[in-house]
């Protein structure tokens, strides 16, 4: 496929890659889902200096971002490694509070209102953040 | 303290339009998300729609979704409630309430609430 | 949608009893749940949040507990003006949706 080399439209470049605030809210699921159909990821920390972009985007709302331990440990969805990566976590958190009954306590992290990090039910309304990388090979076949 | 005060309620034909006016005071009203609730004669009560506090996401139950729209005026500190192709079952008292947050950590403060009846 | 079941749907209590209102939901819901009080001709009131975090000006009589999908509203000692109707909600996701209601009344 070919490179992308700038940022679609509506979207933000920053350090080589494309990022797209949403304005309304989804389940986790549904957010993940909407960032993969524009070949892209829900955004994926891996610096403070990528926090702190991202934090000025989003204001004081809960987002959802790339990271989840839907499957037991911790991962962000782009295969980043959580263990040695980036990580901003609200005092106490990660809790996986298991009171809700959903089988898997809080699965899913988000942003908060002052931009660290909690996890939460996947299922809530929250806004959310698409990445892209520049250079990244697209999805679309080359012209002929 | 923090008021809401719903008013546009009224008697109405099947099938008219009805808009529902609810202001706020007492607080910052562009930092909080706003929701109608309704409650029909001898009923219980039920959510209609939600708008967070700018505007940016509106939610609505299945019973009033493509009829009613809901809106806000940060400037004026007004929520409404736009009803068109108003049915019977749509009569109830119509309350607003403020969101404890942007717009989906539930309700705290309610308006007196407005009375709507649907009727030839 | 989420489905709130509440029982009992109507009560009689007298002044000074312990009474103890439950609320099932169709499926997990985390900790967003409330409770409101209604009396007869008058908005909801609201009592609770996040399960078991009282609303500002609300007396500690009332109290909230559970996780899961069960959830209880327990008032320690009723008093004349607690006669009323309490609902629960869920906030997890849209849409929201309360439970039936509970009719506390006078033994």
């Known amino acids: 496929g070919s490179e992308r080399t700038c940022c679609p439209v509506n979207w933000v470049e920053h350090e080589r890659s494309c990022y797209w605030f949403s304005r309304s809210g989804k389940a986790w699921a549904d957010a993940d889902n909407y960032c993969r159909l524009e070949d892209a990821h829900l955004v994926v920390v891996t610096s403070w200096e990528e926090q702190k972009f991202v934090q000025r985007h989003i204001g004081p709302v809960n987002t959802w971002m790339g990271l989840h331990d839907q499957n037991g440990p911790w991962k962000w969805v782009d295969g980043t490694d959580y263990e040695t990566g980036f990580k901003n976590w609200r005092p106490e958190q990660p809790d996986d509070w298991y009171g809700h009954g959903l089988g898997g306590g809080e699965d899913c992290a988000h942003f908060t209102d002052d931009g660290r990090w909690n996890d939460d039910v996947c299922q809530r309304p929250y806004r959310w953040v698409c990445e892209t990388e520049l250079d990244k090979a697209s999805q679309e076949p080359p012209l002929l | 303290q923090v008021q809401l005060v719903e008013s546009g309620g009224g008697v109405v034909q099947p099938g008219r339009s009805l808009r529902l006016s609810c202001a706020a005071s007492g607080f910052t009203f562009s930092s909080y998300g706003m929701h109608w609730v309704r409650q029909a004669p001898g009923k219980g009560l039920e959510w209609v729609a939600v708008i967070w506090y700018d505007g940016s996401n509106k939610n609505y139950a299945d019973s009033v979704k493509g009829r009613f729209t809901i809106s806000r005026d940060n400037s004026k500190n007004t929520l409404y409630l736009q009803m068109n192709s108003l049915r019977a079952e749509d009569t109830a008292v119509y309350y607003c309430a403020r969101d404890q947050g942007v717009g989906y950590d539930g309700l705290d403060v309610w308006g007196q609430g407005t009375t709507v009846t649907v009727s030839s | 949608d989420i489905q709130m079941t509440q029982s009992p749907s109507s009560l009689s209590a007298s002044v000074g009893d312990r009474v103890t209102i439950t609320c099932r939901t169709s499926?997990?819901?985390?900790?967003?749940l409330a409770w409101f009080q209604q009396k007869p001709g008058k908005a909801p009131k609201s009592l609770l949040y996040?399960?078991?975090s009282l609303q500002s000006g609300v007396p500690s009589k009332f109290s909230g507990s559970g996780s899961g999908t069960d959830f209880t509203l327990t008032i320690s000692s009723l008093q004349p003006e607690d006669f009323a109707t309490y609902y629960c909600q869920q906030y997890m996701t849209y849409p929201l949706t309360f439970g039936g209601g509970t009719k506390v009344e006078i033994k």
């Open positions: 996040k399960v078991s």
């Open positions: 499926q997990g819901i985390g900790k967003y």
